[in-house]
């Protein structure tokens, strides 16, 4: 518990919520998830919990799109009270709010074992690429709430009926998208500051699905009713989501390191990277796969596998050091992840207290650099950018809710991997 401060509010998925405000979270590709209630607590933390449905005492309970729990027909709210949610139109078909459907042709790099799952939520269509589990039966069947076919008796598949497990799956190297970004695993060489890597770690995606289905990669594509197209850019056969950056690959020149392209809805916008005129060292060196020269030195040795420019720039974005400290005693783990910033000059420490796999407490402290420097237990694990930190904190908000009501073993370790800046194949960002 923390003292309430007058300017306290909660940030959740880029939205501000007032203390005491309640809402259903928006989770792609499902849209509004009515079976989870979130509340902004007095200390600025978002607390979410699954709705526990009471047992219904009738033969054929009815599912209503905007209500989580099934109801007996005689206890349904009158029609005029009904929340009228916007329907969606896609490819000439109208879908009701909450309806799931399958789409074709959205993802160019779809594998044979993948299908495109879409849902209609509040007038927007959310689509995701889903990797289907291997089928062990001869005659799989289609089910209404999944684009994957399943073997009979494989359990109920809608997320309302599952135990609310977090959707975890191995990394998919093809799909390269934002927070529910598909590859978290840093290159094996990235051993820094004693942070152990988790070879068998499951990647946490923050999307919610049935635990039976924990085997695919969800990639968000939003198809707005007006535009009828995905918020993706296609460059050189690769798909990039809105906000993602890359170096263009031109046939005549190969990868152009000194140009950075960004996907803006569906348009790619490219700009030249400007290198600094002055470097903090006498002899900056040109390194393959990097646009600007780099000062040789200790930092590069400390953090192998990461492509930083001078002054710690990564693909044109300033980087900041990330530290970690972990204490384990009597079945309780306290994990602290700290980001050091220049403006304002402070260290933001994210404190996780986990007992027997259940999150007991999560909070954020902001401490002065001088106070932080005195703390002996923190090890420098990587440097990261503000945009990666934002992705990290959004993911953190999600897992801090999920892990407070169920056992989480590797979710936080997996999430920390988001902070590692990957030098992708051939050195492009």
């Amino acid at each position: 518990e923390q003292v309430k401060h007058s300017e306290t509010y909660c940030m959740f998925q880029d939205k501000k919520y007032r203390v005491g405000e309640r809402w259903h979270p928006y989770l792609e590709p499902y849209g509004l998830v009515y079976c989870v209630n979130c509340i902004c607590s007095e200390n600025g933390n978002v607390l979410c919990s699954r709705v526990r449905c009471p047992n219904v005492h009738c033969l054929s309970p009815v599912h209503i799109p905007h209500l989580c729990c099934p109801r007996c027909p005689d206890s349904l709210p009158p029609v005029n009270n009904k929340v009228t949610s916007k329907s969606c139109e896609y490819n000439g078909t109208t879908y009701q709010h909450g309806e799931l459907f399958v789409a074709e042709g959205l993802f160019q790099n779809r594998q044979p074992n993948q299908c495109t799952q879409c849902s209609c939520s509040e007038g927007n269509v959310y689509c995701g690429l889903k990797t289907c589990p291997k089928l062990t039966c001869a005659f799989p069947v289609s089910v209404p709430d999944s684009c994957c076919r399943v073997c009979r008796g494989d359990g109920e598949l809608s997320w309302e009926h599952s135990d609310g497990d977090i959707f975890r799956q191995p990394a998919n190297r093809e799909a390269r998208h934002s927070y529910h970004r598909s590859h978290y695993d840093p290159p094996p060489s990235r051993q820094a500051g004693g942070l152990s890597r988790f070879p068998g770690a499951r990647s946490h995606r923050g999307a919610l699905m049935d635990s039976q289905q924990a085997s695919g990669t969800i990639v968000q594509i939003v198809i707005n009713n007006k535009h009828k197209h995905g918020q993706v850019c296609v460059s050189n056969g690769k798909t990039y989501s809105h906000g993602e950056s890359w170096h263009p690959n031109l046939r005549a020149f190969g990868i152009v390191e000194c140009v950075l392209c960004t996907c803006n809805v569906t348009k790619q916008e490219c700009k030249k990277i400007h290198c600094p005129n002055r470097y903090p060292c006498k002899y900056p060196q040109k390194i393959d796969g990097k646009c600007c020269k780099v000062c040789p030195g200790k930092k590069a040795k400390e953090l192998p596998g990461q492509s930083f420019d001078n002054k710690g720039y990564f693909c044109g974005e300033e980087t900041m050091p990330v530290y970690e400290s972990v204490f384990m005693e009597d079945g309780e783990t306290t994990r602290k992840i700290a980001l050091e910033t220049e403006r304002p000059p402070q260290v933001e420490v994210h404190v996780w207290t986990i007992r027997k796999g259940i999150l007991q407490h999560f909070h954020i402290e902001k401490i002065s650099k001088r106070m932080f420097e005195e703390l002996p237990h923190f090890k420098l694990v990587t440097r990261t950018t503000l945009s990666q930190w934002k992705i990290f904190t959004e993911g953190e908000a999600q897992i801090s809710q999920m892990c407070s009501s169920r056992v989480c073993r590797t979710e936080l370790e997996d999430l920390v991997k988001v902070l590692y800046l990957e030098r992708s194949e051939k050195g492009h960002c």
């Epitope: 003292v3 306290t334 407490h361 002065s368 001088r370």
Partner: antibody, heavy 119, light 107 residues
């Protein structure tokens, strides 16, 4: 709500030791540093040091390094401060204090324990 | 150690009056400053943290300002229950250090 319940008043002889306790409730004890502050009669506040209950890490004001020893018992969510080799100058009210979001901004205070050193 | 010089050491003020107490640090403390109010026989109570952020439940007549080395606490319109001793605390660096206090009394 957060509460820090401190042990009762102590009267000790010069050269003796006392161990003060501060029982925390209403929050996750291991998640926040516990600070200790003293106040001599009619004087201002003086910071003694803090302990991080999760790791047992302590940081002392150099002035109290040989005087105070900070420890915690996680199982009972209690912080302790042992004062050794007491002198008359150690007569004071001792407070434990913790914070919410900002280290040093001691938002929650115990009610204080009065220590009187008298022969 | 960072020295916090608080002034005045004591002052008399009338109800409804605007009161300002200042604290000067011996070096830049990056706004890591808190203000406390203490009444006789009671524990200190936090009013302000990070130089200008009001703790919830503290009346809005209290405000904090300043940066670098110079900070101040202002009570816009003094009320009877505001009487007591006010302390500033820097927590930019250990050892944490308090100002000597300002005793506020009714004129």
């Amino acid at each position: 709500q957060v509460q820090l319940q401190q042990s009762g008043a102590e009267v000790a002889k010069p050269g003796a030791s006392v161990k003060l306790s501060c029982k925390a409730s209403g929050y996750t004890f291991t998640s926040y540093w516990m600070h200790w502050v003293n106040q001599r009669p009619g004087q201002g506040l003086e910071w003694i040091g803090y302990i991080d209950p999760s790791s047992g890490y302590t940081k002392y004001n150099q002035k109290f390094k040989d005087k105070a020893t900070l420890t915690v018992d996680k199982s009972s969510s209690t912080a302790y401060m042992q004062l050794s080799s007491l002198t008359y100058e150690d007569s004071a009210v001792y407070y434990c204090a913790t914070y919410s979001n900002y280290v040093g901004a001691m938002d929650y205070w115990g009610q204080g324990t009065s220590v009187t050193v008298s022969s | 150690d960072i020295k916090m010089t608080q002034s005045p050491s004591s002052m008399y003020a009338s109800l409804g009056e605007r009161v300002t107490i200042t604290c000067k640090a011996s070096q830049d403390i990056n706004s890591y400053l808190s203000w406390f109010q203490q009444k006789p026989g009671k524990s200190p109570k936090t009013l302000i943290y990070r130089a200008n952020r009001l703790v919830d439940g503290v009346p809005s007549r209290f405000s904090g300002s300043g940066s670098g080395q110079d900070y101040s606490l202002t009570i816009s319109s003094l009320e009877y229950e505001d009487m007591g001793i006010y302390y500033c605390l820097q927590y930019d660096e250990s050892p944490l250090t308090f100002g000597a206090g300002t005793k506020l009394e009714l004129k």
